[in-house]
């Protein structure tokens, strides 16, 4: 199809080279078609319109995402070329960042209705580049946590160095839709709840003589209770003895709950004693069974393939650990009767 | 308890114009949007539009813009809106509600309302 | 703009019916629907938020349902105190709409 009809846009996504981030661009498709395909709202020249949220769009019609390559070949489709980006309804999401993202997009509905929604497209063009390693050191990360039920901050990565009072109007998004009522380059939250976790991207425009850029940053918001004061505890084995049949295989396993921790490096290890010798066993790797915004539940087996009369000798250690402490429970086995 | 005191009834010709005060008590002013809605009598709820206390950014209703400005004193906790140009169809009852959820979010719901500021447009 | 459709306007019932109220978006609203509840010379008062979430202090006998375009609100018993207009609200994107109310009478 012919795309110089096509509204533009560019943007420019100055990644950070120490952080992992994503990126996205939203379908902004012009009225009357954006109702139509996207259910944006209309709003007045001076508001910005809403975007379609990245859930709840099951029912909503798609838009067709195209790659525009730069030595003039034909359009590329996405979905089949590019595995790292993904397309999202009316969003083009971007999972790892590189100059080879720079390039045009072009997005359109996927079922033409009329002969006008034929030029109804846009074309985004994107400069990707590193950020300047002399851009300062304190840069809001694209990852940022909000503890639940104290006051805090969102700040937008590209515009973090700023005073409030220098700073640019900024446009911010959550979960893809529209956040009017905010425009400075760091939200506050008084009193943080559940519902503030979800991605925000914060807009705003950067002019040179020769053209205006929309710069653009998406950060991941998580909400999180305060780090646990407690040791893990071991949910199972409760027991200290464990009546086995010899010569019969053996799982025993260890379950163990760790409270949340923003930096978590949980320890789980199944040691045995024989005597006076204490050794680490080779088990499977440990696995989360249930997670929480207060803790985690992480489970790790040992497996005896025959159990013989030496393990009857032997005691069974699990031991957990975390930042505050470590846990032991024992176990040691008796043969059923 | 969270509350909204409107100002009182105001009688107002063709032309002019009305300032509808919302005073808010029970509640960290800053952290919750303010809605202004309005009824003409007998009829439903029509939305004009929002403020954000923190910042004082707004968001007009298309039919309304031009016409509506929102302010509000943080000192005071109190939220402002002023209609001009008024004419006989907004005669109505003018409602502030609070917004349920602390911002920033999607809208939730006005979970307080104040009594409400009867405006009657009249030659 | 939303347009938000409200079915009935009016309705007449006995204290112990149940009432079912219908209100359908103009598109696709998700969950942003919410429920107010107002008597004359009141303000109204928020029910059902979330589509389905019943605000603190509201009886059980309030429910709302669905997703999308199509909702409604139920009162499994109806009690003297409910007799007043309904109202339903979208707050998916601005400007924020609301039905045209169904005003439940006694039969």
């Known amino acids: 199809f012919n795309i110089s009809g096509c509204s533009t846009k560019k943007l420019l996504w100055a990644y950070s080279t120490r952080s992992e981030e994503e990126f996205i661009l939203f379908c902004d498709l012009p009225e009357p078609q954006k109702s139509h395909f996207c259910h944006r709202s209309q709003l007045s020249p001076t508001q910005v319109p809403d975007h379609l949220p990245f859930t709840d769009s099951k029912d909503l019609p798609d838009v067709q995402w195209y790659r525009q390559p730069s030595n003039g070949d034909p359009l590329e489709d996405i979905r089949k070329s590019y595995p790292h980006i993904i397309q999202d309804k009316c969003t083009l999401r971007f999972l790892t960042p590189g100059v080879n993202n720079t390039g045009s997009y072009i997005c359109r509905p996927k079922m033409i209705k009329s002969p006008y929604d034929v030029a109804c497209c846009v074309k985004m063009i994107l400069e990707v580049k590193p950020q300047s390693n002399a851009s300062c050191e304190n840069s809001a990360s694209h990852k940022q946590d909000l503890l639940l039920g104290s006051t805090g901050s969102i700040s937008c990565p590209s515009l973090s160095c700023q005073s409030d009072a220098q700073s640019p109007e900024v446009t911010w998004y959550k979960n893809g839709k529209l956040l009017s009522m905010t425009r400075s380059n760091r939200i506050v939250v008084d009193e943080v709840y559940i519902y503030h976790q979800g991605t925000y991207v914060c807009d705003y425009t950067q002019s040179d003589t020769a053209s205006s850029w929309t710069v653009r940053a998406v950060v991941q918001v998580r909400t999180i209770v305060g780090d646990t004061k407690l040791k893990p505890d071991i949910l199972d084995p409760v027991e200290s003895t464990l009546e086995v049949e010899l010569g019969k295989p053996l799982t025993i396993s260890c379950k163990a709950r760790f409270g949340f921790e923003r930096v978590f490096n949980p320890v789980m290890k199944w040691y045995i004693k024989d005597a006076d010798l204490e050794w680490e066993v080779s088990v499977p790797e440990a696995k989360s069974i249930k997670s929480t915004l207060k803790d985690e539940i992480i489970e790790r087996n040992i497996i005896l393939e025959k159990v013989t009369q030496r393990d009857l000798r032997r005691t069974f250690v699990c031991f957990v650990q975390n930042s505050i402490g470590n846990t032991t429970q024992s176990v040691q086995l008796k043969e059923k009767r | 308890q969270v509350q909204l005191v409107q100002s009182g009834a105001e009688v107002k010709k063709p032309g002019a114009s009305v300032k509808v005060s919302c005073k808010a008590s029970?509640?960290?002013?800053?952290?919750?949007?303010m809605h202004w809605v309005r009824q003409a009598p007998g009829q439903g709820l029509e939305w004009m539009g929002i403020i954000n206390p923190r910042g004082g950014y707004t968001t007009y209703a298309q039919k309304f813009q031009g016409r509506v400005t929102m302010t509000r004193d943080t000192s005071t906790s109190t939220v402002y809106m002023e209609l001009s140009s008024l004419r006989s169809e907004d005669t109505a009852v003018y409602y502030c509600?609070?917004?349920?959820?602390?911002?920033?979010?999607?809208?939730?719901?006005?979970?307080?309302w104040g009594q409400g500021t009867t405006v009657t447009v009249s030659s | 703009d939303i347009q938000m459709t409200q079915s009935p306007s009016s309705l007449s019932a006995s204290v112990g019916d149940r009432v079912t109220i219908t209100c359908r978006a103009s598109?696709?609203?998700?969950?942003?629907l919410n429920w107010y509840q107002q008597k004359p010379g009141k303000a109204p008062k928020l029910l059902i938020y979330d589509a389905s979430s019943l605000q603190s202090g509201v009886p059980s006998r309030f429910s709302g349902s669905g997703s999308g375009t199509d909702f409604t609100l139920t009162m499994s018993s109806l009690q003297p105190e409910d007799f007043a207009t309904y109202y339903c609200q979208q707050s998916y994107s601005t400007p924020l709409t609301f039905g045209g109310g169904t005003k439940v009478e006694i039969k």
């Open positions: 598109q696709s609203i998700s969950s942003y």
């Open positions: 029970g509640y960290t002013f800053t952290s919750y949007y």
């Open positions: 509600a609070k917004e349920g959820r602390v911002s920033p979010t999607d809208y939730y719901g006005m979970d307080v």
